[in-house]
């Protein structure tokens, strides 16, 4: 069955599709589809990529990582409850019933209602403008950027997308990748 | 207005060879999923070859090895190279073109274009 | 392989009268629920026509009498009050696996 996902409504929902190009910049055409994987195409297609470069998207569907080495996996840009879901993500290698095919579950939360504080307090002290997260190679790092105000919602979100980041990072290093040639 | 075309056709000898055309216009044919089906006289339908909007190819056992689909989306064509024919090859063979993001079902079909197979 | 057997062969069926066709599906053809069932028309000397995907979904411009249903393995096509037009082969076909498979076909003759 398919492996599930989550995100939060307002967050931005990762679903993870990898493959190894057979050489670098030798690229297979992927496609995303809404709806589980048909017999041939994709379902109802938001995001293609061809043989050198991503030639259909529609809008808060996108490609974060480098498709050119085979990460293909999808961002879902400010989700909402609609987005949840079946998600087929289809990597088209040439030859005879080669496909792969791959049905990902989006299960959308709604957002965590957390109070205001009494006194805002100011975390840029206490909270690291840089995230690492683990990679293969150098680190990976993920910057925050000149925030001069962060509250305790902002901190879960962060929270939030660093352990999502972790786990992409954790699905990569597992070797859940298609490997051509 | 949708149109499938299919041209190639005619009386072939046992062990040889034919290449079947189908052209295709009005709408974007690099966008879909295409078919071969064929029906022999008298007989019902059957599935022949497909090849999807990324180019991967699908065959029944029965003509896998013989039979080879491929397309040119630049001509809008999808074509079936068929060798090493057999009488059982005998039919109308239709070009169809698969719905839209799924491709598994046919909602264009071409006229069809007769193979004979025979001595 | 998908095996798909229609009955009966042939329906003899009166001009305005119902017809109700069967196909059963060796296994089943259900996918994340949906049936993945047609229905195709053909008539003598013409190519096929879809006249319903996904088991009960008429195709555009395809009249109303027409309609589908089952699940599973058992599917039916019913056409509500025949016209003179409708006296063809009726196919039915999975898209669920490769090979795509068709039915034998069912022949609506006039009675």
């Known amino acids: 069955s398919e492996v599930e996902y989550r995100a939060e409504v307002g967050q931005n929902a990762y679903l993870p599709c990898f493959y190894t190009p057979a050489a670098p910049g030798n690229l297979v055409p992927v496609c995303w589809g809404k709806g589980a994987c048909p017999v041939f195409e994709c379902g109802n297609v938001v995001l293609r990529t061809d043989e050198r470069d991503v030639n259909y998207w529609t809008s808060r569907y996108w490609l974060n990582g480098d498709f050119r080495k085979g990460d293909v996996s999808l961002t879902i840009e400010n989700v909402t409850l609609a987005d949840s879901g079946i998600y087929c993500c289809r990597i088209q290698i040439p030859g005879i019933m080669n496909d792969e095919k791959f049905n990902l579950k989006l299960v959308i939360k709604p957002a965590k209602v957390t109070p205001a504080p009494t006194r805002q307090r100011d975390f840029t002290a206490a909270f690291p403008r840089m995230l690492t997260t683990r990679g293969h190679g150098p680190a990976e790092t993920q910057t925050l950027g000149s925030l001069p105000d962060i509250n305790l919602t902002q901190i879960s979100t962060l929270a939030n997308e660093l352990r999502d980041s972790r786990l992409a990072n954790d699905l990569r290093d597992s070797g859940a990748t298609i490997r051509i040639g | 207005e949708v149109q499938l075309v299919e041209s190639g056709g005619g009386l072939v000898q046992p062990g040889g060879s034919l290449r079947l055309s189908c052209a295709a216009s009005?709408?974007?044919?690099?966008?879909?999923?295409m078919s071969w089906v064929r029906q022999a006289p008298g007989k019902g339908l059957e599935w022949v070859a497909a090849?999807?909007?990324?180019?991967?190819?699908y065959y029944p056992d029965s003509v896998k090895g013989r039979f080879t689909i491929s397309r040119d989306n630049a001509k809008n064509t999808l074509y079936l190279q068929m060798n090493s024919l057999r009488a059982e090859d005998t039919a109308v063979y239709y070009c169809?073109?698969?719905?839209?993001?799924?491709?598994?079902?046919?909602?264009?079909w071409g006229q069809g274009t007769l193979v004979t197979v025979s001595s | 392989e998908i095996v798909l057997t229609q009955s009966p062969a042939t329906l003899s069926v009166s001009p305005g009268e119902r017809a109700t066709l069967s196909c059963r599906a060796s296994?089943?053809?259900?996918?994340?629920?949906?049936?993945?069932m047609q229905w195709y028309q053909q008539k003598p000397g013409q190519a096929p026509r879809l006249l319903i995907y996904?088991?009960?979904n008429v195709e555009s411009g395809i009249p109303a009498r027409f309609s589908g249903s089952g699940s599973g393995t058992e599917f039916t096509l019913t056409i509500s009050s025949l016209q003179s037009e409708d006296f063809a082969v009726y196919y039915c076909?999975?898209?669920?696996?490769?090979?795509?498979?068709f039915g034998g076909g069912t022949k609506v003759e006039i009675k």
């Open positions: 169809a073109r698969g719905r839209e993001a799924d491709g598994g079902y046919f909602d264009y």
């Open positions: 009005g709408f974007t044919f690099s966008r879909y999923a």
């Open positions: 090849i999807s909007s990324g180019g991967s190819l």
């Open positions: 296994e089943s053809v259900e996918y994340y629920g949906t049936s993945l």
């Open positions: 996904a088991a009960s």
């Open positions: 076909q999975q898209s669920l696996k490769v090979p795509l498979t």
